[in-house]
């Protein structure tokens, strides 16, 4: 296992996100990841750590008590309203997207360090197998925990949703892409206000930096609201054209990174390696897939969600 761990570490330095056999596949626990696991596809919470308090839009109609409210707002990247290009919101709906780490790409050695593609693919595969084994172990532990510790009836413990329930909730949910980084859940809820009763709104955040990723999920009370909300596809929200599509359910054991869509390859020039948002964004996948060449230009591949 030590050798495998070393290989996995080396795969990180080599890019480890290669196309073909080197591309990572994810085992999806249930219909979506646990809290903070970076699993936008499921009905779970998505590890949104940083929070800040702001007045709700509907509160402006009320008479607030005359007390000063502290303004606690974390620093966050602001995308200019008319920013060209695809912008944020690039995680595929229901995809098991990895969390975007700020700064350098894992073990980026700088310019020119290109390893043997076959070796890289092997290392990536080892790493992939280890990850899957780890996820299986976690899943097994979770099942055992649930079997041993089912709370007595009447106890208001956390509700464990079945896969069927998660899929049903996903059928009442939409994916919203290209969401401005400064947007709040309240603003997003207000934008979809006329579509029906909302059960929950989640703006996905990066697990490491706490910054918003630029996409969100909205769960409605009924499926009809999903259909109504699709009319807001390409509508303007905070000066940006948002993408609204039905949320896709992740099924356990099925790779969500391998969608079988044709791949488009292109080269993109990125120089600001310190910015958490500097990597080239394409369509719905925020992370470059395929061989990541370590020269100045990077060849990436991407999948359109449909």
């Amino acid at each position: 296992m030590a050798a495998a761990a070393a290989a996995a570490a080396a795969a990180g330095a080599a890019g480890g996100r290669g196309s073909g056999p080197g591309r990572r596949r994810h085992l999806v626990p249930g219909a979506g990841g646990e809290a903070g696991e970076g699993a936008p596809g499921g009905a779970g919470d998505y590890g949104n750590g940083l929070e800040s308090e702001e007045l709700e839009p509907e509160e402006l109609l009320l008479e607030p008590e005359p007390e000063p409210e502290p303004e606690e707002e974390p620093p966050r990247p602001r995308a200019p309203p008319g920013a060209p290009g695809p912008g944020p919101g690039s995680g595929a709906p229901g995809s098991q997207e990895e969390e975007e780490e700020p700064g350098l790409v894992e073990g980026d050695p700088g310019d020119g360090a290109i390893e043997d593609p076959e070796l890289e693919a092997i290392k990536a595969r080892v790493r992939e197998m280890e990850e899957e084994a780890e996820k299986l172990k976690e899943l097994q532990n979770e099942v055992e925990k649930q079997m041993n510790m089912s709370p007595p009836p009447g106890n208001a413990g956390p509700v464990i949703m079945s896969i069927e329930e998660k899929m049903e909730a996903d059928a009442r949910s939409i994916y919203v892409g290209n969401v401005d980084y400064g947007a709040t859940a309240e603003e997003l809820e207000a934008h979809f206000h006329g579509c029906g009763s909302v059960n929950r709104v989640t703006i996905l955040c990066d697990k490491f930096s706490g910054h918003p990723k630029g996409f969100a999920y909205i769960e409605f009370s009924d499926k009809e609201s999903v259909r109504t909300s699709l009319a807001l596809d390409e509508s303007l929200f905070r000066g940006r054209q948002i993408k609204v599509i039905p949320k896709r359910t992740n099924r356990p054991g099925i790779s969500t990174t391998d969608r079988g869509f044709p791949r488009a390859r292109y080269r993109a020039r990125t120089t600001n390696y310190n910015s958490s948002r500097s990597r080239f964004y394409s369509g719905f996948n925020s992370r470059p897939r395929g061989r990541v060449y370590r020269g100045r230009a990077r060849a990436t591949s991407w999948y359109s969600p449909y």
């Epitope: 809290a35 903070g36 919470d45 949104n48 940083l50 929070e51 800040s52 308090e53 702001e54 709700e56 607030p64 008590e65 007390e67 409210e69 502290p70 606690e72 956390p158 709040t184 859940a185 309240e186 809820e189 909302v198 059960n199 929950r200 709104v201 989640t202 703006i203 996905l204 955040c205 918003p212």
Partner: nanobody
Framework: EVQLVESGGGLVQPGGSLRLSCVAS????????MAWFRQVPGNERELVAT???????SYAGSVKGRFTISRDNAKNTVDLQMNSLKPEDTAVYYC?????????WGQGTQVTVSS
Amino acid sequence: EVQLVESGGGLVQPGGSLRLSCVASGRTSRISRMAWFRQVPGNERELVATMSSSGITSYAGSVKGRFTISRDNAKNTVDLQMNSLKPEDTAVYYCKYSSRWNIYWGQGTQVTVSS
């Protein structure tokens, strides 16, 4: 994920009182806002009262002076004390939890004011 469970609804006579309670469990945020909304069939949800984690409260004009919202941050609960109830207060009352990145709604509890 955050789960909200409301309780305390029921049938009450005009002029009577009820206390609604909402418990938030799961990954709640230190900085958040909890609110009570109500909905009459065929109408939209209407904001009744809200309270921020720093204790700032707001009320709808129709309930001001009759309803009081209170919150226990340590226990993640928000209560709505409803006094001098009127027939027009009849509705399903929903608890709402909102933070910067997340919003969750409860399933609702029925309040009926009738003689």
